[in-house]
């Protein structure tokens, strides 16, 4: 049997014998074009990608669209795998979503939604999220209805305030809504009572900024 | 209609403590954050915190941590604000205040008609 | 924290005169302003929110403008109703901080 040579996401990786983590190169939908990825292969039976990932502060998320669209930072530490790769690979199968957060006391918990996609850019990559379980909240600290991508220079929330612009970072704002895991990052002794943190409102409350975050996807049927 | 009554008039001496009530009515208590909001006499608003009554959380003004203590009792719709070791510069009008929106502390559109706490020996 | 200056403190004007309030704000609070008014023992009344957006029931002749550090609040033609303390109030960060205040008075 041919070896498979290109991935299209870190379950293809897994599957194929490659199960330790860290980062590999995936390969766009339909496409030669490629992109570094963060795979996770221990969490809940490995094969995930990796799309979002804060620990530290290291790297500015306060991007333009462009750089959302494209990705930025290093797999290896904070980074945004980039939506127009997320938003072709998860238009292609059913992917799940998990959210892991940590705080600043030691807590940790996660959002785990059974089914994910991003619209096309066209769409401003609006998020699609259903089947909400997990210890981070019983209700979605994404707005449901999904809500379309804004950043610093694209704005598309429905609050007339820019809230990419006041609450930094680019993020599926709403009015401005229950979270943003792009938000400044704050360290600790400094990560209360601000409104522009990182923040799942319906874990911590909306004055807490998180200490680390962590976007992961994998197929549905993995 | 939305409607916030808070208790009335205390005077209390320099040291001791004052706890004042703010009753909603006509909204979903949980749905809103509630602020505390305080006014001497003459004088200009000063923002003292806040209080999620969904959570419970809360975020003070850092002139007032470790004095103040903001509370709710989703039973009864009513949230209370206790100010502790009370000094003379204490004295002003505490006004509770309804947030316009749950996730942040953003503007104040609904206000209670004010509580005067007057400190005096 | 973050001041928010206000000017004039006190202005006297007569019916149907255009006042205008303006606030500072010692930072870039971007729109996050609001401003009250406030009557002689009421408490404060919500007039304006992100900088220029009237609340409902407040009549046009209110107007606010500005973002950044820059705001203002226009009264386009005083009602005798308008007589009242006008504070302006920044939401941008933590603490919120309000402005002075600024008395409007019969001339």
């Known amino acids: 049997k041919e070896e498979q040579t290109t991935f299209r996401d870190c379950a293809e990786i897994f599957k194929s014998g490659l199960t330790t983590s860290g980062i590999y190169t995936l390969t766009f939908p339909n496409s030669t074009e490629e992109i570094k990825a963060y795979c996770d292969m221990d969490v809940g039976g490995g094969g995930w990608t990796v799309i979002q990932h804060r620990e530290d502060g290291s790297v500015d998320f306060q991007r333009t669209w462009k750089e959302y669209k494209e990705g930025f930072g290093s797999p290896l530490g904070e980074y945004w795998l980039g939506n127009e790769f997320v938003s072709q690979l998860t238009g292609q199968h059913r992917y799940v979503l998990k959210i892991q957060l940590k705080d600043w006391e030691g807590n940790e918990a996660h959002s785990l939604y059974d089914h994910f996609y991003l619209a096309g850019e066209e769409s401003n990559y609006r998020i699609h999220l259903t089947g909400l379980t997990g210890t981070a909240g019983k209700i979605s600290s994404i707005s449901q209805p999904g809500s379309d991508f804004s950043t610093k220079d694209s704005d598309n929330d429905k609050c007339i305030c820019k809230c990419s612009q006041m609450l930094s970072g680019g993020w599926w704002f709403d009015a401005c809504g229950p979270s943003n895991l792009n938000g400044q990052y704050y360290p600790q002794k400094q990560n209360t009572n601000k409104f522009n943190g990182i923040k799942w409102y319906y874990w911590k409350g909306s004055g807490y900024s998180l200490k680390a975050t962590t976007m992961m996807i994998r197929p549905a049927d993995f | 209609q939305v409607q916030l009554v808070q208790s009335g008039a205390e005077v209390k001496k320099p040291g001791a403590s004052v706890k004042v009530s703010c009753k909603a009515s006509g909204y979903s208590f949980t749905d809103y954050n509630m602020v505390w909001v305080r006014q001497a006499p003459g004088q200009g608003l000063e923002w003292m915190g806040y209080?999620?009554?969904?959570?419970?959380?809360?975020g003070y003004n850092q002139k007032f941590e470790g004095r103040v203590t903001m509370t709710t009792d989703t039973s009864t719709s009513t949230a209370y604000m206790e100010l502790r070791s009370l000094r003379s510069d204490d004295t002003a009008v505490y006004y509770c205040a309804r947030t316009r929106d749950r996730y942040d502390v953003w503007y104040f559109d609904v206000w209670g008609q004010g509580t005067l706490v007057t400190v005096s020996s | 924290d973050i001041q928010m200056t206000q000017s004039p403190s006190s202005v006297s004007a007569s019916v149907g005169d255009r006042v205008t309030i303006t606030c500072k704000a010692s930072?870039?609070?971007?729109?996050?302003v609001a401003w009250y008014q406030q009557k002689p023992g009421k408490a404060p009344k919500l007039l304006i929110y992100?900088?220029?957006t009237r609340d409902t029931g407040v009549p046009s002749r209110f107007s606010g403008s500005g973002s950044g550090t820059d705001f203002t609040l226009t009264i386009s033609s005083l009602q005798p109703e308008d007589f009242a303390t006008y504070y302006c109030?920044?939401?941008?960060?933590?603490?919120?901080?309000f402005g002075g205040g600024t008395k409007v008075e019969i001339k």
């Open positions: 992100w900088a220029s």
């Open positions: 930072q870039d609070v971007y729109i996050a």
């Open positions: 209080i999620d009554p969904y959570n419970g959380g809360t």
């Open positions: 109030h920044q939401y941008s960060s933590y603490p919120p901080t």
